[in-house]
């Protein structure tokens, strides 16, 4: 990656790390307005199975693992990227390593959900306060989940699907910060581990994933008012361990694994037309990326 100053542009889709033959240290950013990719400062340690989020204009890379020819190390790391300086800096680590983690942000706090350390599949959840650089455990989920999709809607944290160490899951649960408790919600129509989960227009979307037999291209969304999951148009590619984010009212899915190939494909969903379109390709195929969008 480049070490010069990053151009000062608007909202970019950042993709960090990932896996292709080994864990990757790439940080790249896609500008949907002109279709260009920027090559930015590498992560200090390669990692896949990480999650990305943005708080206060800073990009955070959370958890994952470094799967390299020299070994395989699950990560408890939290690293912070400043787009203005194009530099990474380490923050306080989590209490445990969390590979295939999910993260969400409520009120400027980062919630790290599930993930694995070796063969241990976590149900634990911890919250990071950037202003104090501290992590604190909160109530554990009702279910152990790795490859969990996490999204925040109306200041509630949703954990969707994943793998509990024995079974891939269609179950989902919701965390209430004020009560510090989790409650199950309606299960998805489809078992999904390693799905992309995000929020768009008051609905939680779950895209792709792996059902224990095959990668999926199906997509469903949860309406919090009716408490029901409904299928929408499928993606063009089956994919698990994909990256997902929302940019200007559209969902973007990045990369993933289709059972044969590490995808470079980036698809975009338009909810107005219920259609997916291929919008760009990443510079190389990869799965297990962390994705987030810079704030305005």
């Amino acid at each position: 990656g480049s070490m010069g100053h990053a151009p000062k542009v608007g909202r970019l889709i950042y993709t960090a790390g990932g896996y292709f033959r080994q864990s990757l240290s790439y940080l790249e950013a896609y500008n949907p307005s002109d279709g260009t990719w920027l090559d930015l400062a590498d992560l200090q340690v390669p990692r896949s199975g990480l999650a990305g989020c943005v708080v206060g204009g800073l990009l955070y890379a959370v958890g994952g693992r470094n799967n390299s020819p020299d070994g395989n190390t699950d990560s408890s790391a939290l690293d912070c990227y400043n787009p203005m300086t194009n530099q990474w800096s380490p923050c306080a680590p989590m209490s445990v390593p969390r590979n295939r983690i999910g993260v969400g942000v409520i009120d400027g706090h980062i919630y790290a959900v599930g993930g694995s350390h070796g063969c241990i599949h976590h149900n634990s959840v911890e919250r990071y306060e950037p202003e104090r650089d501290e992590w604190h455990l909160v109530a554990p989920m009702l279910t152990r989940r790795i490859g969990v999709g996490v999204a925040v809607l109306n200041r509630l944290l949703y954990a969707v699907g994943g793998f509990d160490g024995t079974n891939r899951l269609n179950s989902a649960e919701c965390y209430y910060p004020e009560r510090n408790e989790w409650r199950m919600i309606t299960a998805m129509n489809t078992i999904r581990s390693g799905a992309g989960v995000c929020v768009l227009h008051n609905c939680i979307y779950a895209a792709g994933g792996y059902d224990g037999q095959d990668q999926l291209n199906s997509v469903e969304r949860y309406d919090v008012e009716t408490e029901t999951w409904t299928f929408v148009a499928p993606m063009k590619h089956r994919r698990s361990a994909l990256g997902i984010t929302v940019h200007q009212g559209r969902i973007y899915v990045l990369g993933g694994y289709d059972g044969h190939t590490f995808l470079d494909s980036v698809e975009c969903y338009d909810p107005d037309t219920d259609t997916w379109s291929e919008v760009t390709r990443m510079t190389s195929g990869r799965s297990g990326v962390g994705v987030a969008v810079t704030m305005e």
Epitope: Y19, F163, Y210
Partner: antibody, heavy 117, light 107 residues
Framework: EVQLVESGGGLVQPGGSLRLSCAAS????????IHWVRQAPGKGLEWVAS????????LYAKSVAGRFTISADTSKNTAYLQMNSLRAEDTAVYYC??????????WGQGTLVTVSS | DIQMTQSPSSLSASVGDRVTITCRAS??????VAWYQQKPGKAPKLLIY???SLYSGVPSRFSGSRSGTDFTLTISSLQPEDFATYYC?????????FGQGTKVEIK
């Protein structure tokens, strides 16, 4: 009936290459982690490599990392182990096996790889 | 790497005997331990997974237990077909490692 059948073993000179195949029947390899385990003559078992069906991530023993590559072709329901830069100490029976919880439940009959000049 | 130290390396026993084989992990491996039986010229067969779960089709005379980092395979009443080599394996952390094996021979 679940079956794993290895092939591709044989005699190869040091520095040479071989590609082992593991044909699965009775289950889809897309539904399980597939592992290769080897056993040198008169010795114990040594885990070699694995591939995760969900993420595509692969893991390797340090003794083979950078030389061996595990892969899977779900359309053929077959897993592979590409072995390059072979050494005398790679001589072993190579088994393909399927993960089950914290164990390996189905094993092939094994294929012998002999590295010798 | 986690070492799995198996003992004894060999033992002699008679049909009907109770046989115990132990594996000690060099660090915590939770319950991520399996036991296998292997006969000469054959592939290993899974007996026990997750430290104490009996694999489908395996006779109930085989059992597994855990105490901390010590894992035990017990054959309650040895049968003629049980004379073989037994291996433990941990899959708690990368890389997965096996014990060196215990050969059970006829006394």
């Amino acid at each position: 009936e679940v079956q794993l059948v290895e092939s591709g073993g044989g005699l190869v000179q040091p520095g040479g290459s071989l590609r082992l195949s593991c044909a699965a029947s009775g289950f889809a390899i897309s539904a399980s982690s597939i592992h290769w385990v080897r056993q040198a003559p008169g010795k114990g078992l040594e885990w070699v490599a694995s591939i995760d069906p969900e993420t595509g991530e692969t893991l390797y023993a340090k003794s083979v990392a950078g030389r061996f590559t595990i892969s899977a072709d779900t359309s053929k329901n077959t897993a592979y182990l590409q072995m390059n830069s072979l050494r005398a100490e790679d001589t072993a029976v190579y088994y393909c096996t399927r993960a089950h919880a914290y164990g390996l439940d189905y094993w092939g009959q094994g294929t012998l790889v002999t590295v010798s000049s | 790497d986690i070492q799995m130290t198996q003992s004894p390396s060999s033992l002699s026993a008679s049909v009907g005997d109770r046989v115990t084989i132990t594996c000690r992990a060099s660090q915590s491996v939770s319950s991520a331990v399996a036991w296998y039986q292997q006969k000469p010229g054959k592939a290993p067969k899974l007996l026990i997974y997750s430290a104490s779960s009996l694999y489908s089709g395996v006779p109930s005379r085989f059992s597994g237990s855990r105490s901390g980092t010590d894992f035990t395979l017990t054959i309650s009443s040895l049968q003629p077909e049980d004379f073989a080599t037994y291996y433990c394996q941990q899959s708690y952390s990368f890389p997965s490692t096996f014990g060196q094996g215990t050969k059970v021979e006829i006394k």
